[in-house]
């Protein structure tokens, strides 16, 4: 009998075992098998859910998320004069999305090629760390943004350097926190070769020693500390914001602001319902089932939930759109294939014509550099 480290492994819910038996392939060749997965795991690793559905969703996220977040980061860094706290949080949100999305081509290739990772262990760890890091970063920056939006309604004071510095400090603290909480994902060996399928998995098969208790405790802690608590803060901020907006006097400008605030709330709510809640809930339930029963019957749901969590990179630009004038203008112009400069020239021309003819029949959307905060 071939001896190996007798450690069983389960991944996501994929159950694999160190194989101490001689394995003979259909061609009659004896292979020294180290890790072996059960039939359920084999069907998942070779099935359409992971080799067709996941790459399709990840491709959509990449195609939409990369340019929109790239443009957002560019707008917030180089096209927004006043760096309000909202701008700082959105810039960090865009950066978090970009850091996750840039690795998606590798993720897409991995799934298309039958869950076979050929890019080395280090890149796998980076991909997984950034994948979870992005989700938790998004939750925290979204919370900061939500609380800040409420704070602006309560205290509508002008921009101050102090506020911006606080926002920068909070952002740095979030990055540091996320780096710390994702350390286990970088430290754990994420790649495992499955000879029976002739593939090297990335994160899909993990040592049982790690999974049974540790992964449950890890994701439960994250779900409570980095999901539930921020979700409560976000919900509170929006509930209070709605109350404030309801009670405030309504002029045309306030009505516009109110509508945009409602759109923002709906967008963030959608993000929580689609991206954050299912993934965090199923991470806990899934690892609890593995811990208590040795198998997870919610694996397919868990996979879909984690996949949908990446859609936050596509939904975030809508948040920027409802919060930032600058991003809104650049987004409109990018979609209409116009440059901001061209629009400004058009504006100047139209304004002068309007004044000379004493006509007020046409009014172009303003593209002056201004941010709602």
């Amino acid at each position: 009998t071939i001896q190996g480290t007798n450690r069983s492994s389960k991944g996501r819910s994929l159950i694999g075992k160190v194989d101490g038996t001689s394995h003979v392939t259909g061609k009659g060749v004896t292979v020294e098998t180290v890790f072996s997965v059960d039939e359920f795991s084999a069907s998942v690793l070779t099935g359409k859910l992971t080799t067709v559905f996941l790459p399709i969703v990840y491709t959509i996220v990449f195609v939409v998320g990369l340019p929109s977040n790239g443009m957002a980061l560019w707008v917030f860094l180089f096209r927004t004069k006043k760096k309000h706290p909202a701008v700082i949080y959105m810039a960090n949100l865009a950066l978090a999305d970009l850091l996750s999305v840039i690795w998606f081509p590798l993720k897409i290739a991995y799934h298309i090629h039958g869950n076979n990772w050929i890019y080395g262990e280090a890149l796998c760890n980076v991909l997984i760390g950034f994948f979870y890091g992005n989700m938790y970063c998004s939750i925290l920056f979204m919370t900061c943004l939500s609380v800040q939006r409420y704070w602006v309604i309560v205290n509508p004071m002008g921009h101050s350097r102090k506020k911006a510095n606080i926002a920068i400090g909070i952002s740095l603290a979030i990055w540091l926190l996320i780096l710390l909480v994702t350390i286990p994902l970088y430290v754990v060996k994420q790649t495992i070769f499955i000879p029976a399928l002739n593939i090297t998995t990335c994160h899909d098969v993990l040592p049982e020693q790690l999974l049974v208790g540790d992964m449950f405790n890890y994701f439960l802690s994250l779900a409570i500390g980095v999901f539930l608590f921020p979700a409560f803060l976000t919900a509170s901020a929006y509930v209070l914001m709605i109350r404030m907006l309801r009670s405030s006097a309504m002029d045309e400008n306030s009505e516009k602001k109110r509508k945009r605030a409602i759109k923002l709330i709906v967008t963030v709510l959608a993000m929580y319902l689609i991206c954050f809640t299912p993934s965090n809930l199923l991470l806990v339930v899934h690892y609890f089932l593995i811990k208590s029963q040795g198998q997870s019957h919610v694996y397919a749901l868990y996979i879909v939930a984690l996949c949908l969590s990446t859609l936050n990179s596509c939904i975030d630009p809508f948040v920027y759109y409802f919060v930032s004038h600058d991003f809104r203008d650049h987004a409109k112009n990018a979609l209409l294939c116009r440059s901001v400069r061209t629009v400004k020239q058009m504006q100047v021309s139209l304004t002068s014509k309007k004044h000379s003819r004493k006509s007020s029949s046409y009014s172009s959307s303003s593209t002056t550099v201004k941010t709602s905060y």
């Epitope: 819910s13 394995h23 059960d38 039939e39 029976a196 029963q293």
Partner: antibody, heavy 121, light 107 residues
Framework: EVQLVESGGGLVQPKGSLKLSCAAS????????MHWVRQAPGRGLEWVAR??????????YYADSVKDRFTISRDDSQNMLYLQMNNLKTEDTAMYYC????????????WGQGTTLTVSS | DIVMTQSHKFMSTSVGDRVSITCKAS??????VAWHQQKPGQSPKLLIY???NRHTGVPDRFTGSGSGTDFTLTISNVQSEDLADYFC?????????FGSGTKLEIK
């Protein structure tokens, strides 16, 4: 209801050959890994061989004691599992059980009623 | 291969009593242990998997416990039909291996 029915056992002389069969019903046979486990008279249970599903290219595994003498195979279209035994030894005398491995790799969840092999001159 | 040791070959008990059958693994198998029951003249049947989970249709007087290397099958309120051999089995790594069995006798 899951049912596994073994057949083909009997009396064989040492160095002889015999093929055991197992008819499976009540589940999607092609999805599961299947095993042969034996129990010699008055002794414990001993794993003999394992065959995987099509997903894993029907990979086969054997205990050291039967390697190169026994061959496990399956016919998914007929829901049948087989064990071809060659160069039989007296120590192969046992009750042979056809066993289903749980879909999640958690133990053996269903056993057949067994078929007896006696190797004697 | 992992060796599963059932120290008691025989255990004697009375109807209505509570009995505990133990099993020790030669190395850490986490919770990947099953218990099988084999009544006289019958084939084995799965009772417990993943150390403590009852298989479909198994009466709740059968409970499993333990993790790592030490495992216990407890039968509370023993019934006459519980007269059988009880085998532990590890499935932490291939090949799956069995304990030598404990025969439960009813006084």
């Amino acid at each position: 209801e899951v049912q596994l029915v073994e057949s083909g056992g009997g009396l064989v002389q040492p160095k002889g050959s015999l093929k055991l069969s197992c008819a499976a019903s009540g589940f999607t046979f092609y999805s599961y890994a299947m095993h042969w486990v034996r129990q010699a008279p008055g002794r414990g249970l001993e794993w003999v061989a394992r065959i995987r599903s099509k997903n894993v290219h029907y990979a086969t595994y054997y205990a050291d004691s039967v390697k190169d003498r026994f061959t496990i195979s399956r016919d998914d279209s007929q829901n049948m599992l087989y064990l071809q035994m060659n160069n039989l030894k007296t120590e192969d005398t046992a009750m042979y059980y056809c066993v289903r491995e749980d879909y999640y790799g958690s133990s053996y969840d269903y056993w057949g009623q067994g078929t007896t092999l006696t190797v004697s001159s | 291969d992992i060796v599963m040791t059932q120290s008691h070959k025989f255990m004697s008990t009375s109807v209505g009593d509570r009995v505990s059958i133990t099993c020790k693994a030669s190395q850490d198998v986490r919770s990947a242990v099953a218990w099988h029951q084999q009544k006289p003249g019958q084939s084995p049947k799965l009772l417990i998997y993943w150390a403590s989970n009852r298989h479909t249709g198994v009466p709740d007087r059968f409970t499993g416990s333990g993790s790592g290397t030490d495992f216990t099958l407890t039968i509370s309120n023993v019934q006459s039909e519980d007269l059988a051999d009880y085998f532990c089995q590890q499935y932490s790594s291939y090949p799956f291996t069995f304990g030598s069995g404990t025969k439960l006798e009813i006084k």
